[in-house]
């Protein structure tokens, strides 16, 4: 029999302790929010918010400008000064709760925990390849706002998610805020609202539409808004909230809320429960039928998918899919299975399920006892009746009221439990060639770049490396700038190439040359590297 090279075990062909140094910026405090801007003329910027300060960085992560956003009441607060002579509210630190772009102007909008959660608008001024912020405009009109009715009170200190949508020649802010009794009483942000920026940038239009947790439920029913995004004709919010208004408030589950992006109204507000499970190939005795539930969403991102994953999900290449990282509970503590699981929900399927749920509620024959739901937002009612009413009147439509769809959308872990003990804290999905890659940040400050495929019993790593020595958790929000992703960990912002930080973690030539084409790996004497790292012979075709 011919002698053959001994086969190197797959795990031995790579080394995840290899150090990669990626560009970074020290913000001087815990990073609270981050957003990127790319103009049409090669100008770009990264905006990084920490307590009481907003940094403007160039594409190279070098500081371009810095702005004091607090403390409120401090004479040095530059944003506060835009609201004229104070005092405007109780003094205190400003934690940035919202940092979004209004691309039409273009402008950056920042909203903080101080000054009733008001926002500031900063016009963007391109200067070469960098961007500067113009003097802020205060989006607050004192005479239009009261504690019980405050169109300019946007951010909640408990957390707020905003997605900006352009409709015609106007910008609408789709806002979702976590509330409790104290916050609701002090400056009345709403749970979910659609607000329109006034044309003179003096605040938000007074007649905005909103839903809010009813006062009687504010103490016991808390909604965390994890993610928001806009795709197609809808804006979506992802929430973690108690499964029931009446039962144990610690029994949480995840919901998707859908709002129209073309009509700024809330009559067609819909919610759907997302169910993510770990279903091991061989079920242990006593394990639950259908798999172990992972009801709590930790992070999410939506992206179009590559050909291979699209085939596995039975959808077309390029279709938008919502990816979520789920854990078993709020603390994400160890259970029987892995710490984190990843589920994929095709957006078209989500929309179909929602539309079918509306038909079940509103088209006769309606199943008796089918509830409209959302009892924390509206009076209880049965389909097809409007909230709080016993019957439909001739001039009302069943479809013009918020609805919780009666069925849930169930998926299983794409990674088959292979994330194991890893606690994922950040997620961004990209399509590279025909490959779909999940870029994940972890609780211990690492980045995992892994191909999203379903059918394997091992993970296909692009990379797995530590961002630095601090080991601090990677934060939830990730931004993209060109071919890089920006991750925040502790007081640092890191710039990670989408194609991976390098190839040195591939130890064997065979493994090196089998790396994805987009990584640009080749064998370089006795190591795997990219061509720019290789002064000598660089080989992509065959091993020596």
């Amino acid at each position: 029999e011919d002698w053959q090279c001994p086969r190197t075990p797959y795990a031995a062909s790579r080394d995840f302790d290899v150090k990669y140094v990626v560009p970074s910026f020290s913000a001087g405090g815990l990073v609270q929010a981050m957003v990127t801007y790319e103009g049409d003329r090669n100008e770009s910027a990264v905006f990084v918010a920490i307590r009481n300060r907003l940094h403007v960085l160039g594409p190279d992560l070098k500081s371009v400008q810095s702005l004091a956003t607090g403390p409120a009441g401090d004479p040095g607060c530059q944003t506060c000064a835009a609201c004229g002579p104070g005092p405007h509210g109780p003094p205190g630190d400003t934690d940035t709760k919202v940092l979004v772009l209004d691309p039409a102007l273009p402008a950056l909008v920042s909203c903080g925990s101080s000054l009733q959660g008001r926002c500031f608008l900063h016009d963007l001024e391109p200067q070469g390849t960098a961007v500067h912020l113009a003097a802020p405009a205060c989006l607050f009109s004192a005479h239009h706002n009261r504690p019980d009715d405050c169109p300019d009170c946007v951010a909640s200190p408990l957390g707020t998610r905003v997605t900006v949508v352009e409709q015609g020649q106007a910008s609408y802010f789709y806002v979702a805020s976590s509330l409790d009794a104290a916050v609701a009483a002090s400056f009345s942000p709403r749970s979910v609202s659609i607000r329109r920026l006034k044309a003179d940038a003096s605040g938000f239009a007074p007649g905005f539409v909103a839903l809010s947790v009813l006062p009687k439920h504010l103490v016991s029913y808390s909604i965390e808004y994890v993610h928001s995004f806009h795709t197609g004709a809808f804006v979506y919010f992802l929430t973690v909230q108690p499964a029931s208004v009446t039962d144990d408030p610690s029994a949480l589950h995840t919901r998707l809320a859908r709002l129209s992006a073309t009509e700024p109204e809330l009559g067609d507000y819909r919610e759907l429960v997302l169910d993510c499970r770990f279903a091991p190939k061989r079920r242990r005795r006593g394990a639950p039928e259908g798999g172990q539930p992972y009801p709590v969403l930790r992070v999410a991102h939506s992206a179009p998918v590559g050909a291979q994953l699209a085939t596995e999900l039975s959808i077309a290449e390029g279709q938008e899919v919502l990816f979520g990282v789920f854990v078993t509970g709020k603390d994400g503590g160890p259970g029987v299975g892995p710490n984190s699981v990843v589920c994929a929900f095709p957006i078209d399927l989500l929309d179909t399920l929602i539309d079918e749920g509306v038909e079940r509620c509103c088209e006769s024959p309606v199943h008796p006892g089918l509830r409209r739901g959302l009892d924390f937002f509206q009076s209880p009612s049965f389909c097809p009746n409007p909230p709080g009413l016993e019957a439909l009147s001739p001039n009302t439509s069943c479809r013009h009221f918020p609805l919780l769809v009666s069925s849930s959308f169930s998926r299983v872990d794409l990674f088959n439990g292979l994330l194991g003990p890893v606690q994922v804290t950040a997620l961004y999905v990209t399509r590279l060639d025909n490959v779909t890659v999940a870029h994940m940040g972890t609780m211990d400050g690492r980045i995992l770049q892994v191909e999203l495929v379903r059918s394997l019993n091992y993970l296909l790593y692009v990379s797995n490396f530590s961002l630095g020595d601090s080991g601090q958790p990677v934060q939830r929000d990730v931004s993209r700038l060109g071919d890089h992703l920006l991750f925040a960990s502790g007081d640092q912002v890191f710039q990670v190439p989408i194609q991976g930080p390098g190839c040195r973690h591939f130890l064997t030539c065979g493994r090196c040359l089998r790396a994805w084409h987009f990584m640009g790996c080749g064998w370089c004497g006795n190591m795997c590297g990219q061509q720019k790292e290789c002064p000598g012979s660089w080989q992509q075709d065959h091993c020596p």
């Epitope: 049409d40 039409a104 015609g168 020649q169 006034k198 239009a205």
Partner: antibody, heavy 117, light 111 residues
Amino acid sequence: QVQLQESGPGLVKPSETLSLTCTVSGDSITSGYWNWIRKPPGKKLEYMGYISYSGKTYYNPSLKSRITISRDTSKNQYSLKLSSVTAADTAVYYCARSKYDYAMDYWGQGTLVTVSS
Amino acid sequence: DIVMTQSPLSLPVTPGEPASISCRASEIVDNFGISFMNWYLQKPGQSPQLLIYAASNQGSGVPDRFSGSGSGTDFTLKISRVEAEDVGVYYCQQSKEVPPTFGGGTKVEIK
């Protein structure tokens, strides 16, 4: 100071395509909305359409099958094409900028286009 | 499309005196607590200039003597003390629904 200047032929034959260009100075067409409006003799001002900062377009449904608005960001210009013109398309054509809600705060001086053989 | 009707068609004015122009929309042009009504002045030989946006907000550089009011379907442009340079054609425009539509114009001239 923001300035807009229309340019293009003043005379177009029926059934041909009317082409106008608006050159912008003092602002970038990669922010805001860039509109075309016309005023036929003896009629109301008529809103034709816009191209946005991102290149998105909106066209008045009454013209939709005939109108195209495009842009050249490198020259900071945007253009109007109106096909299959008739005498009813004779008008003064204006380009104008809006930042919000179709409130047009800067206008070109207007150019008269006559459709005649 | 929303039809905008202006009155009067022609308005002879005396310098120093007030003047007022009306505009009526064929349907309500309010939404979100905002009235989507703009006013323009086209002086002789010039292009239109924005006077008032969102019913009552003054355009940049517009003299204080110009003011706008109204809501729903009925709107008014007022000139508190007319000056000779205010002559020209005044247009109202709604921007609540697309396409935006204009009134037929009111010609203001000195008596």
